[in-house]
């Protein structure tokens, strides 16, 4: 028969997906490159099922996400169109706010402690959640 | 028992290129993330570069992008750097690291190393 | 790139000596340090990860504290095969920077 495929290990497997949920903070460039050292990426919310499911791992805690416009327009790192994609904004946001006294705007997207989203300043030390696709994930064997 | 053997060092003229080698043994190699760091003789330590489980994603200083390149064979449990317009300010020793994650601490750390290749470039 | 400025760069002790390095982070790392010892001609061995645990092997008479931006490497009695240089190293951040080293001699 056909050899099943999982997540390495502390990671959970979802929808086709693999997904691993910090427990402590770094600015949104050092969890980006955690989750790239881990062979995944921030993790990309391409539906409802999809933030639901995220949502009920982090609880009420602000969460990194694989959102930013950095470079201008907003952009999922793995290159999902962001306009024609998945979108759960709190109210008034994304809004780049200034008046934060830290400089700049806010250029990266985060799980609010209601789940939806704000952009903030990529330098906060929010938690972060990673993702890779199981085939991917299955290719080596899992850290042990 | 944990082992990274270095080897690929020598002497190359400036703008002159070589490829370093590590062979690990003791763990499964393919699941952990690789490092390169160096050490000018008497002097202290700098990292150079990281490669991911997969090579999926590579990492380097600022003083070598664009010059050196980082890959890994899992199937041989080897890591390299490719070293190319190699500069004086190039020379040391070379020691390849292993990455160690502790899921615990959301923390990356560089556990073991070898006993590193030396690296000479004449100008 | 996170600086981290070791002190001293270098110290005179004695057998039996407690003995204190201090690794400053330019800024906050949480625990994401290891401290690592190396003699000359060898490789670094790591003695101290997350900030305070003890590498496996690693006798007790080293401890790591801290947290933040301040980190202390303590031996608490000086044995003769632990004179040989010293090296902090943060993770939190990339790219990965250490300290300066702190040199041990015999005093």
């Known amino acids: 028969g056909s050899e099943r495929t999982c997540c390495p290990v502390n990671w959970v497997e979802h929808e086709r997906s693999c997904y691993w949920f910090s427990r402590s903070g770094k600015a949104w460039a050092d969890a980006d490159n955690y989750c790239r050292l881990e062979d995944a990426h921030l993790v990309v919310v391409t539906s409802w099922e999809e933030q639901k499911f995220v949502q009920h791992h982090i609880g009420p805690v602000n969460t990194w996400m694989g959102l930013h416009d950095q470079n201008g327009p907003w952009k999922w790192v793995d290159g999902t169109d962001y306009e024609t994609g998945f979108k759960n904004w709190r109210p008034e946001q994304p809004d780049d706010w200034y008046g934060h006294g830290l400089g700049g705007g806010e250029d990266c997207a985060h799980f609010t402690d209601d789940g939806r989203w704000n952009d903030d300043v990529c330098q906060r030390p929010y938690r972060w959640v990673c993702e890779t696709e199981l085939d991917k994930a299955s290719q080596e064997p899992p850290l042990l | 028992e944990v082992q990274l053997l270095e080897s690929g060092g020598g002497l190359v003229q400036s703008g002159g290129s070589l490829r370093l080698s590590c062979e690990a043994s003791?763990?499964?190699?393919?699941?952990?993330?690789m490092n390169w760091v160096r050490q000018v003789p008497g002097k202290g330590l700098e990292w150079v570069s990281a490669?991911?489980?997969?090579?999926?994603?590579?990492f380097y200083a600022d003083s070598v992008k664009g010059r050196f390149t980082i890959s890994r064979d899992n199937s041989k449990n080897t890591l390299y750097l490719q070293m190319n317009s190699l500069r004086a300010e190039d020379t040391a020793v070379y020691f390849c690291?292993?990455?160690?994650?502790?899921?615990?601490?959301?923390?990356?750390?560089?556990?073991?190393w070898g006993q590193g290749t030396t690296v000479t470039v004449s100008s | 790139d996170i600086q981290m400025t070791q002190s001293p760069s270098s110290l005179s002790a004695s057998v039996g000596d407690r003995v204190t390095i201090t690794c400053r982070a330019s800024?906050?790392?949480?625990?994401?340090v290891g401290w690592y010892q190396q003699k000359p001609g060898k490789a670094p061995e790591r003695l101290i990860y997350?900030?305070?645990s003890l590498q496996r092997g690693v006798p007790s008479r080293f401890s790591g504290s801290g947290s933040g931006t301040e980190f202390t490497l303590t031996i608490s009695s000086l044995q003769p095969e632990d004179f040989a240089r010293y090296y902090c190293?943060?993770?939190?951040?990339?790219?990965?920077?250490f300290g300066g080293g702190t040199k041990v001699e015999i005093k």
């Open positions: 190293l943060q993770h939190y951040s990339y790219p990965p920077t």
């Open positions: 003791g763990f499964i190699f393919s699941s952990y993330a």
């Open positions: 800024q906050d790392i949480r625990n994401d």
């Open positions: 690291a292993k990455g160690e994650l502790l899921e615990d601490y959301s923390y990356y750390g560089i556990d073991v």
């Open positions: 490669i991911s489980r997969r090579g999926g994603s590579t």
């Open positions: 997350a900030a305070s």
